[in-house]
Amino acid sequence: TIDTKRNISAEEGGSVILQCHFSSDTAEVTQVDWKQQDQLLAIYSVDLGWHVASVFSDRVVPGPSLGLTFQSLTMNDTGEYFCTYHTYPGGIYKGRIFLKVQESSDDRNGLAQFQTAPLG
């Protein structure tokens, strides 16, 4: 089975860890695919290791474990993420995560704390 946090949130400009946990007494993981909606983020294979899709190579870092660290988040990154575990002999298992990217606290609080009285 696949166990994951179904809903997570992170701040714009920040980073988030996308993690699925696969548990089985008999099946072994041979490959894990990560997608943002329909778009490939990265693939891990026991034979070949990690490959991050070139579209995301500057923002996606493999790990920890079989998860991904997604950096420099934008509001457009809000949406569904899917992990697909290919296992032998168990077949294919899928997990879903919904990521909500929120405005950074600085934006929400305004810039008042950075304003100073004019000198003189």
Partner: antibody, heavy 118, light 107 residues
């Protein structure tokens, strides 16, 4: 540098047999799925067969099923295609190809021409 | 089997033109779509994998988009070395299938 070098093509009569080889170098051959793709003269690309990295699974196009056999020898870094009961419509350039993650073909051989004619 | 339909089958264009080639799958294939370039007498070469990822070493004037059933390959500014035949290919399920090809010729 990744290299895939096909050999074994040639002229054969209908009903005859040929065995194609593909010698791989420059990468860990045993880690990759490998495929055969063919191209008839002046035509498009047609997938023929594939084999998983550990040789556990093989797949074939309907047009060659029961006549062609894909195999590999990971100790020799070599991919094979045994072609039996050849037909005129099997005439084509045959390419061996490397397929990481069973997703895309990132390297192709230069191809070997198989001509089936009487 | 999944059918891949490419259009147009051929086109004439000039150096510097923006060229768009489309590929339609007979059923949803998510982003399991790859694009290849082939020149006469040569093996195909991977341009775009997973619908939108640029293969290492391929010029950035090539780009891919789409998901599900409809996909596009775009050459933003056609160069002399880009005159070739382009194929899409789905890897969603066996048998793997290719589009019929689009030949890009000099106008």
């Amino acid at each position: 540098e990744v290299q895939l070098l096909e050999s074994g093509g040639g002229l054969v009569q209908p009903g005859g047999s040929l065995r194609l080889s593909c010698a791989a170098s420059g990468f860990t051959f045993s880690s990759y799925s490998m495929h055969w793709v063919r191209q008839a003269p002046g035509k498009g690309l047609e997938w023929v067969a594939s084999i998983k990295s550990d040789t556990s699974s093989t797949y074939y196009a309907d047009s060659v099923k029961g006549r062609f056999t894909i195999s590999r020898d990971n100790s020799k870094n070599t991919l094979y295609l045994q072609m039996n009961s050849l037909r005129a419509e099997d005439t084509a350039v045959y390419y061996c190809a490397r397929v990481p993650y069973d997703y895309w073909i990132d390297y192709w051989g230069q191809g070997t021409l198989v001509t089936v004619s009487s | 089997d999944i059918q891949m339909t490419q259009s147009p089958s051929s086109l004439s264009a000039s150096v510097g033109d923006r060229v768009t080639i489309t590929c339609r799958a007979s059923q949803s294939i998510s982003s399991y779509l790859n694009w290849y370039q082939q020149k006469p007498g040569k093996a195909p070469k991977l341009l775009i994998y997973a619908a939108s990822s640029l293969q290492s070493g391929v010029p950035s004037r090539f780009s891919g988009s789409g998901s599900g059933t409809d996909f596009t390959l775009t050459i933003s500014s056609l160069q002399p070395e880009d005159f070739a035949t382009y194929y899409c290919q789905q890897s969603y399920s066996t048998p793997l299938t290719f589009g019929g090809g689009t030949k890009v010729e000099i106008k």
